[in-house]
């Protein structure tokens, strides 16, 4: 079970966005296949994407186990048509990952507004919850469990007939905000973690929703 | 080390035009929002406007709207204040702060300010 | 546009006095208040945040404390380099609104 003419992985990159997270690499195979190996800084061992011929391996199961925990990841190449065989002492060449955090360093998913109710000159608008694969006592947590207050969002809101943003913050998924009565709205929001330090700290903005539209309600 | 500066201040006449620049290092303002404060001579601190380097969105406030637009140039970790149609009541320091978006914190950091005046 | 109504203007304190400055806002912010001290010349420096939590390398000297729309800002016991102006600042909501400023001068 030689290795010769295989070639170790590079790039090898995280992409994760609310802990769905899968490992990147190259190159496209050419007469190899890779086998994907996750464990935390203390833990063993465990193999994933066994002889694959694709460059990304899904590791969501492994780091939802413990979001907090810091993970690395290697990636093996073999040659095409290898079977795993007992009496091989050749390793394979593989590389590292870089370490990857999910907790510090998965991407805020782009948030939705899920309703927006207005009473007199009041609004409440409500953001929806993500589920996340996160699991608690065998129940998948929401974005909201996993961050709690760690986790705030931004609205903008704006009158359909102007262009200056005001914003609103909350720690919570609602926002109670005043607004002048007759006048129609628009409002997007952004899920931050401001106690992030990296570029990972902000999602992108959600879809503008107005009032006057479907999501919306209105009552005296 | 996170830091601010301003740059640009001087003295114009009313009705003139000014571009203030705050230039950020130690961070990336697209992950943050800019706010742009200033402080008459004497007097106390007054909010102008903010921008959100990721979106673009700006609010000012009510007695420079119109006349003062606030941009950012995340390539070159900078935000702008554009002055236009000063009067003498613009007369001010004018500070930039870095705002977290946190539910908790305000202004976190503020640059050294730049002095603006307007007289003839 | 929320106004924050800071008290007093001014006062006069020894070094070792204890030092009260108290913000009214006119609605509901819930806890989304920072202090600032800000000395001539200088940009405003953040104290407090949220009301009541003393921001990284603030003395302990220092504290602040709410009770619905009155915010209050606590120094125990004055030492020579807080003399200077202090500011609130609600940022509840857009725009943020600043108190008048209350400058501790040395009696």
């Known amino acids: 079970s030689g290795t010769t003419n295989t070639v170790a992985a590079y790039n090898l990159t995280w992409k994760s966005t609310n802990f769905k997270t899968i490992l990147e690499w190259e190159p496209k195979p050419i007469n190899q296949v890779y086998t994907v190996q996750i464990s935390t800084k203390s833990g063993d061992w465990k193999s994933k994407c066994f002889y694959t011929a694709d460059t990304e391996c899904d590791l969501t199961d492994e780091i939802v186990k413990d979001v907090k925990q810091t993970y690395l990841a290697r990636v093996f190449s073999y040659p095409a048509g290898h079977v795993e065989s007992t009496g091989s002492t050749e390793e394979p060449p593989y590389e590292n990952s870089p370490e990857f955090t999910p907790y510090l360093e998965t991407n805020l998913g782009q948030p939705t507004i899920q309703s927006f109710e207005q009473v007199g000159t009041k609004v409440n608008v409500t953001v929806q919850d993500e589920w996340t694969l996160v699991r608690r006592n065998d129940t998948f947590l929401s974005l909201r469990d996993v961050f709690g207050k760690d986790l705030i969002y931004t609205l903008y809101y704006w009158k359909s007939s102007s262009s200056g943003k005001k914003t609103a913050k909350t720690n919570t998924n609602e926002f109670l905000i005043d607004v002048d009565k007759g006048e129609n709205y628009c409002f997007s929001v952004q899920a931050v973690i401001p106690s992030r330090r990296t570029a990972n700290r902000k999602s992108t903005d959600s879809p503008v929703e107005c009032m006057g539209h479907e999501k919306g309600e209105s009552r005296e | 080390e996170v830091q601010l500066v301003e740059s640009g201040g001087g003295l114009v006449q009313p009705g003139g035009s000014l571009r203030l620049s705050c230039a950020a290092s130690?961070?990336?303002?697209?992950?943050?929002?800019i706010h742009w404060v200033r402080q008459a001579p004497g007097k106390g601190l007054e909010w102008v406007g903010y921008i959100d380097p990721s979106n673009g969105y700006t609010y000012y406030a009510d007695p420079v709207k119109g006349r003062f637009t606030i941009s950012a140039d995340t390539s070159k970790n900078t935000a702008y204040l554009q002055m236009n149609s000063l009067r003498a009541e613009d007369t001010a320091v004018y500070y930039c702060?870095?705002?977290?978006?946190?539910?908790?914190?305000?202004?976190?950091?503020w640059g050294q300010g730049t002095l603006v005046t307007v007289s003839s | 546009d929320i106004q924050m109504t800071q008290s007093p203007s001014s006062l006069s304190a020894s070094v070792g006095d204890r030092v009260t400055i108290t913000c009214r806002a006119s609605?509901?912010?819930?806890?989304?208040v920072a202090w600032y001290q800000q000395k001539p010349g200088k940009a405003p420096k953040l104290l407090i945040y949220?009301?009541?939590f003393l921001y990284s390398g603030v003395p302990s000297r220092f504290s602040g404390s709410r009770s619905g729309t009155d915010f209050t800002l606590t120094i125990s016991s004055l030492q020579p380099e807080d003399f200077a102006t202090y500011y609130c600042?609600?940022?509840?909501?857009?725009?943020?609104?600043f108190g008048q400023g209350t400058k501790v001068e040395i009696k």
């Open positions: 130690g961070f990336t303002i697209s992950d943050y929002v």
């Open positions: 600042q609600q940022h509840y909501t857009t725009p943020p609104t």
């Open positions: 702060a870095r705002d977290p978006q946190s539910f908790y914190i305000a202004f976190d950091y």
């Open positions: 949220s009301a009541s």
């Open positions: 609605q509901d912010v819930n806890t989304a």
